[in-house]
């Protein structure tokens, strides 16, 4: 069954945590649907963003952070492992020095920590996708 | 009650027709939600687009056409009558020489016909909005 989009969930992250998302683009890549995942510092959507991950399907991926309300230096990748009309599984793992983004089991993107992942309080998944799974796995202590 | 988004409806347009849309942005303007309305030449979403109207809320509106699969010259406006979190009523009227776009009763944008409006077979409304009304009014002959 489908989860509501935008989908918002409270989350605490640290090294070893993984956020897993399953979904499908809602339009053909010719029409450039988007997927966005934002790791926020508060439960409010206007809050700062520790990790911003935006896919323009068929075109590019941009990653960034929003600090004190201002967007910082954007990181862009043309790597496009997503397929038109097909379900994807996205997993974002918190490594000691960076986020590692896997698409359908393949390491596809990395983003160095700019703000410690412990600052994350909420994850939002939104834009032009249907969402069937959202999970945050916590490292067993 | 809410209409599904993306929302697709078969439509025939000619001078005097008006497409009316009521909706609300799904995210705060700081996060740049989008609204898109596309007038297609076929019931397929990959088909050509006679009139493409895209709002990046808080930033700009772009209008264009997609002919033989290729985007043409983009028309951009910074006029931003939409408000954060508030319902909008958008009406697109087919005039003899152009489309006239009204936002909350005010003429806000125009786009000269590049392809005759009679070529339109389908209208799609999508991206980061909730949709409460979609109507096509036809000129009484």
């Amino acid at each position: 069954s489908l989860l509501p989009v935008p989908y918002t969930e409270a989350a605490s992250l640290s090294t070893g945590s993984t956020v897993t998302i399953k979904g499908r683009p809602l339009a053909c890549f010719l029409n450039e649907p988007y997927l966005q995942v934002d790791f926020h510092t508060e439960m409010k959507e206007e809050s700062d963003i520790v990790f911003h991950f935006q896919v323009c399907f068929g075109r590019r991926v941009v990653m960034n952070s929003r600090e004190y309300g201002a967007w910082k230096q954007q990181v862009e990748s043309k790597n496009m492992p997503f397929q038109d009309g097909q379900e994807f599984e996205l997993s974002i793992s918190v490594l000691p020095d960076k986020y590692q983004v896997m698409v359908n089991g393949q390491s596809s993107y990395t983003f160095d920590h700019r703000i410690k992942p412990e600052a994350v309080k909420m994850v939002q998944v939104w834009r032009d996708i249907s969402l069937t799974k959202f999970n945050v796995s916590y490292l067993k202590r | 009650s809410l209409l599904p988004v993306p929302y697709t409806e078969a439509a025939s347009l000619s001078t005097g027709s008006t497409v009316t849309i009521k909706g609300r942005p799904l995210a705060c303007f700081l996060n740049e939600p989008y609204l898109q309305v596309d007038f297609h030449t076929e019931m397929k979403e990959e088909s050509d687009i006679v009139f493409h109207f895209q709002v990046c809320f808080g930033r700009r509106v772009v209008m264009n056409s997609r002919e033989y699969g290729a985007w043409k010259q983009q028309v951009e406006s910074k006029n931003m009558p939409f408000q954060d979190g508030q319902e909008f009523e958008l009406s697109i009227s087919v005039l003899p020489d152009k489309y006239q776009v009204m936002v909350n009763g005010q003429s806000s944008y125009t786009f000269d016909h590049r392809i005759k409006p009679e070529a339109v077979k389908m209208v799609q409304v999508w991206r980061d909005i909730s949709l409460t009304k979609f109507n096509v009014s036809y000129l009484k002959r």
Partner: nanobody
Amino acid sequence: QVQVQESGGGLVQAGNSLRLSCAASGRTFSSYHMMWFRQAPGKEREFVAAIAWRGGTYCANSVKGRCTISRDNAKDTVYLQMNSLKPEDTAVYFCAASLRYVFDPSAMDYWGKGTLVTVSS
């Protein structure tokens, strides 16, 4: 936290132009939507113009065609250019900052103290 301060008001002849400035301080200025309002003696505060954090703009019907709003994020400043001024434009002009792009004075997060504009016929 954002502090805002207006300047550029004064006495102007009808038909002339005026540019008001709003200087903001605070490291989050670029993420705020900025608005101008005005209040004539004995009247409610009314919306004049808005510029979103990403540069979208809107002017109220009362000033449409005579109003240009712009911002310079490098200088943390917003400008309101008013042309073809009329005596009914006489008011105290206020600059405001908001995290929400709305044209409602009650939704503003921060206000300046205002600058008086008097248009003489």
